[in-house]
Each structure stands twice: as C-alpha cells, then as structure tokens.
C-alpha cells in the first residue's frame, strides 16, 4: 500500500531536526526505545509523541535553551516548531489518546531523534516497496 503522507512529513521533519544542533539537543529525554520489545507500532508512536511533548513543554521557554545570541534564540524557536510538528504527526499516526511512559533509561534528544528517524525510514521502506 502507499505510504501515508504523514509518514513522509515525519521523516522530512526528522531530517531537518537531526541536521541542527542547538543548546537543548544534548538535554536528556526518556528513552522509550531501550526496551520496546512488547510494544506495538502505534504505542511506540504514541509514546514517542508523549516524550516530545514533555520535552518541549518543559524547555520551550527555558533560558538555558534560548541562548545568549539572536541566532541561538532563533534556532531554538525553530527546534520547538519542528518538535511540535513531529508531535502532531506522531499522534496522527498513533491514533491513540494517551499512553504511559515509565522507562528509567535516558538518552539525549539528539540520539532519540536519530533512533526515531531510523524506525521511520524502516517503516517507509516497507510501505513503499
């Protein structure tokens, strides 16, 4: 079957996100991928969205992330916009209202996004073949 347009948007947004480093991409998030053996695909998407929402809710106006220069501030705003777009599209793919995120493991946001990108590219290659 054809790949969902949302999936293409997610990969595109992840490509943009992983290209840019900001003051906040080294901050840690819950690593939902560390032990996701018994998790459905929809649950994974839902939990990834939950992690992203937690991150931008906490750090949107975080002075550590805003930086001291206009360029740092601008980059941080762009990061938040991309994370919100990603969150929105992941919720759309998941089709679930809520999901628990209880893992103790942590990873940097940067690594989390790279892992998510790998998963999404794998999904895309399956649905486009």
């Amino acid at each position: 079957h054809k790949c969902d347009i949302t999936l293409q948007e997610i990969i595109k947004t992840l490509n943009s996100l992983t290209e840019q480093k900001t003051l906040c991409t080294e901050l840690t998030v819950t690593d939902i991928f560390a032990a996701s053996k018994n998790t459905t695909e929809k649950e994974t998407f839902c939990r990834a969205a939950t992690v992203l929402r937690q991150f931008y809710s906490h750090h949107e106006k975080d002075t550590r992330c805003l930086g001291a220069t206009a360029q740092q501030f601008h980059r941080h705003k762009q990061l938040i916009r991309f994370l919100k777009r990603l969150d929105r599209n992941l919720w759309g793919l998941a089709g679930l209202n809520s999901c628990p995120v209880k893992e103790a493991n942590q990873s940097t946001l940067e690594n989390f996004l790279e892992r998510l990108k790998t998963i999404m590219r794998e999904k895309y290659s399956k649905c486009s073949s």
């Epitope: 948007e9 595109k12 943009s16 949107e60 601008h74 705003k77 762009q78 938040i80 916009r81 991309f82 919100k84 777009r85 929105r88 919720w91 759309g92």
Partner: antibody, heavy 120, light 107 residues
C-alpha cells in the same frame, strides 16, 4: 522590523490569471513555513495554501487545488501565489502570513492584504 | 476537513464585562487551536496559540482553555479596544480551518 507586504492584486476577468507577491523583511524567509489566507468581502477567514520553510512541501484548500500554486524565492525573501483559471468566488482580500515563532501552522505575522476582484 | 463552530455568532457587551466565546471542533484536535482578533479593514492578530498560550505582547486579560473538541476564549474585563471579530483556527491537520467568527459589539 518584521513585516510582510503583498502586491499584485487587482481586477481580472474570470478564467484569467494573476500572480501575487509577498515581500518579507526583518526575518529570514527560509526558516519559516509561509501561508496565504483569504477573506471574501463581508465573510470570514479561509486558509488557501502553505509552503514549508524549504519549499519542498505544499498543501492547498480543495477550493483552489489544481488552479493555484504557491512558491517562494528565499534568495529574494519573497513568497508568491500564482492564481490560474480565476472564478468569481476567488474575489477576496489575500493575506500572506508567517507561521508562528513557537508553533507551526498558526499565523503570527500578517501582511496588510491585497484585494483580488474577479469580474466580467 | 475539520469543522469549527463558534458560539455565539455575535454578542453585545459592555466595557468591564467578562466575555467567553466557545469553539467546537467536529473531531478531536488535541490542543492545536489558535484564536485571532480582527478589526474592520485590518489583518487578523494572533492572541492565543496551542489552545492556552498567550502570544507575546497580548494583554493578560485574554486567556484560552480547552482540549480535544471544546475550547474557550475568555476576556476577563472588556476594554474599548477589544470590540472586534474573533476567530478560532485549528492546525491539527491540513486543510487548516477557521471558525465562522464571533462579532463582539458594544452594548
């Protein structure tokens, strides 16, 4: 300061074409998604189209799909709307708008609008 | 497309009044809702985004709440400059849609 200025509006006959421009200043166009929103006389707001920051993704309202094309020239900091096969119901004030600083697909900066009248 | 229904379509109020405008979505849109104010002959102005976040420079008498399908815009104490038309907008998915507007008039 941050500003959007539309141009290119006017009166045109049904079936003809028109190209609107939106010049951005005070920010880098290539960092933001950009939209066109229109408002028919005495009516509410209608979203028309969006182009992503890098120009690679565009979406359109069903009412203009196949007739309107959004594009951007980031080197000129300018957004465009090519309108073909115009109809009377396309008569409206056309606004270009920038996506929000903190959220995608909302509009935090608007132009002053340019009037498009489609009439024979 | 997601439909947004605002109520009331118009209302009359006095300076100092507390006013609430509601916006209902035809399906769940999480918190992907914004509110705008528009005065005659002018472009709209963003007031609230993400359902409840106040846009920079907007007076604190404006507030937004809600999630899912039901949202409200509240003006805690109307000022003379607040008489205008208000629109809600969803950005949960394309096509982006607006409510039909609520016209706020002086009583």
């Amino acid at each position: 300061q941050v500003q959007l200025v539309e141009s290119g509006g006017g009166m045109v006959q049904p079936g003809r074409s028109l190209r609107l421009s939106c010049a951005a200043s005070g920010f880098t166009l290539s960092s933001y998604g950009m939209h066109w929103v229109r408002q028919a006389p005495g009516k509410g707001l209608e979203w028309v189209t969006v182009i992503w920051y890098d120009g690679n993704n565009q979406y359109y309202a069903d009412s203009v799909k196949g007739r309107f094309t959004i594009s951007r020239d980031n080197s000129k900091n300018t957004l465009y709307l090519q309108m073909n096969s115009l109809r009377a119901e396309d008569t409206a004030v056309y606004y270009c708008a920038r996506e929000g600083s903190w959220s995608p697909d909302i509009f935090d900066i608007w132009g002053q609008g340019t009037m498009v009248t489609v009439s024979s | 497309a997601i439909q947004l229904t605002q109520s009331p379509s118009s209302l009359s109020a006095s300076v100092g009044d507390r006013v609430t405008i509601t916006c209902r979505a035809s399906q769940g849109i999480s918190s992907y809702l914004a509110w705008y104010q528009q005065k005659p002959g002018k472009a709209p102005k963003l007031l609230i985004y993400d359902a409840s976040s106040l846009e920079s420079g907007v007076p604190s008498r404006f507030s937004g709440s809600g999630s899912g399908t039901d949202f409200t815009l509240t003006i805690s104490s109307l000022q003379p400059e607040d008489f205008a038309t208000y629109y809600c907008q969803q950005f949960n998915s394309y096509p982006i849609t607006f409510g039909q507007g609520t016209r706020l008039e002086i009583k």
